[in-house]
């Protein structure tokens, strides 16, 4: 039996290897039964995670899911970081799992480091 | 029915690769975790890594990282374990996983593939 | 690394029988969403270990309702509360917070 709650689908530890300089949306897939709730995203700052206020968002919607847009556009060095995506649902605020970005600064093409690379070099971004 | 089944294992010799593959379905692969998992005769179980099919984001253990590479085919529902320079004492059966991501709602295990090591 | 340890390593007992297997973690296993992501695993000789227990205390589809898990941060318990001839293999505590993963050595329970 599907569940009517709302369910947000980001992976739990899910990582992005980004370049700075580039265009970036950052997907929070968003299943709901009727009303589509209000989502928000924010950035973790230790254990506390900032609303973003102003920055451009937008929805997509396919038939079984809908995906709430964060838009990088373009992505800066400082987006560096961790970001979670909240619904808030008959008075209840779902939060998702944190997804975090690893921005490196822009390099010539055939330079740019693997996403294995990425992943076991996380002093590239600072 | 949900099934992860490995294959590729044998006996190879040392200093020599071998590409295991994990073939899945009953799920979608972009939903979940793909794990490599090994255990020596005898011995406990040990995290080779892991692999997100949804963007090919990889992740592995100190000893593996260099030496292992964890790769999978989101369209073909396929995940691999590509070991190179083997030693006799990567003699193991290997095991892929596949853990839903979001809400842990399933953990399935192949039944495993055994690589021997020797000349 | 996270180092994961069992206790037993091994354990005679009988159909019936009420078995607590222990596993004490190196450091918490708290996640920043609150959550421990400990799980319990079954193997038996020759085949393929199976999850049992994920979230600490959150039974798998299909295990029995004799197994539990239960603990909070670095402490960690599986319990059977009777034991049945099938419960009879080697149970693996492993972690999945922190990068690497890691694994008990396993607790090998055999019948008396």
């Known amino acids: 039996k599907e569940s009517c709650d709302v369910q947000l689908y980001i992976k739990r530890q899910s990582e992005h290897s980004i370049l700075a300089g580039d265009p970036f949306e950052l997907e929070c897939p968003v299943k709901y039964c009727a009303n589509r709730p209000h989502v928000t995203w924010c950035k973790l700052n230790g254990t506390t995670c900032v609303k973003l206020e102003d920055r451009q968002t937008s929805w997509k919607e396919e038939k079984n899911i809908s995906f709430f847009i964060l838009h990088f556009e373009p992505v800066l060095p400082n987006d560096n970081g961790s970001y979670r995506c909240s619904a808030n649902f008959q008075s209840n605020l779902i939060e998702s799992h944190s997804t975090t970005l690893y921005v490196t600064d822009v390099k010539s093409a055939s330079e740019r480091p693997s996403k294995d690379e990425m992943a076991s070099r996380p002093w590239l971004l600072y | 029915e949900v099934q992860l089944v490995e294959s590729g294992g044998g006996l190879v010799q040392p200093g020599r690769s071998l590409r295991l593959s994990c073939t899945t379905s009953?799920?979608?692969?972009?939903?979940?975790?793909i794990h490599w998992f090994r255990q020596a005769p005898g011995k406990g179980l040990e995290w080779v890594g892991r692999?997100?099919?949804?963007?090919?984001?990889?992740k592995y253990t100190a000893s593996f990282k260099g030496r292992a590479t964890i790769s999978a085919d989101g369209s073909k529902s396929i995940a691999y374990l590509q070991m190179n320079s083997l030693k006799t004492e990567d003699t193991a059966v290997y095991y892929c996983?596949?853990?839903?991501?979001?809400?842990?709602?399933?953990?399935?295990w192949g039944q495993g593939t055994l690589v021997t090591v020797s000349s | 690394d996270i180092q994961m340890t069992q206790s037993p390593s091994s354990l005679s007992a009988s159909v019936g029988d009420r078995v607590t297997i222990t596993c004490r973690s190196s450091?918490?296993?708290?996640?920043?969403?609150?959550?421990?992501?400990l799980n319990w695993l079954q193997q038996k000789p020759g085949k393929a270990p199976k999850r049992l227990i994920y979230?600490?205390?959150k039974l798998d589809s299909g295990v029995p309702s004799r197994f539990s898990g239960s603990g909070s941060g670095t402490d960690f318990t599986l319990t059977i509360s009777s034991l049945q001839p099938e419960d009879f293999a080697t149970y693996y505590c492993?972690?999945?917070?922190?990068?690497?993963?890691?694994f008990g050595q396993g607790t090998k329970l055999e019948i008396k």
């Open positions: 009953g799920f979608n692969i972009k939903d979940t975790y």
């Open positions: 996983a596949s853990y839903e991501g979001y809400y842990e709602r399933f953990g399935y």
């Open positions: 492993w972690q999945d917070t922190h990068f690497p993963y890691t």
């Open positions: 692999n997100d099919p949804a963007n090919g984001n990889t």
């Open positions: 450091q918490s296993l708290l996640d920043r969403d609150g959550k421990s992501y």
């Open positions: 979230l600490v205390s």
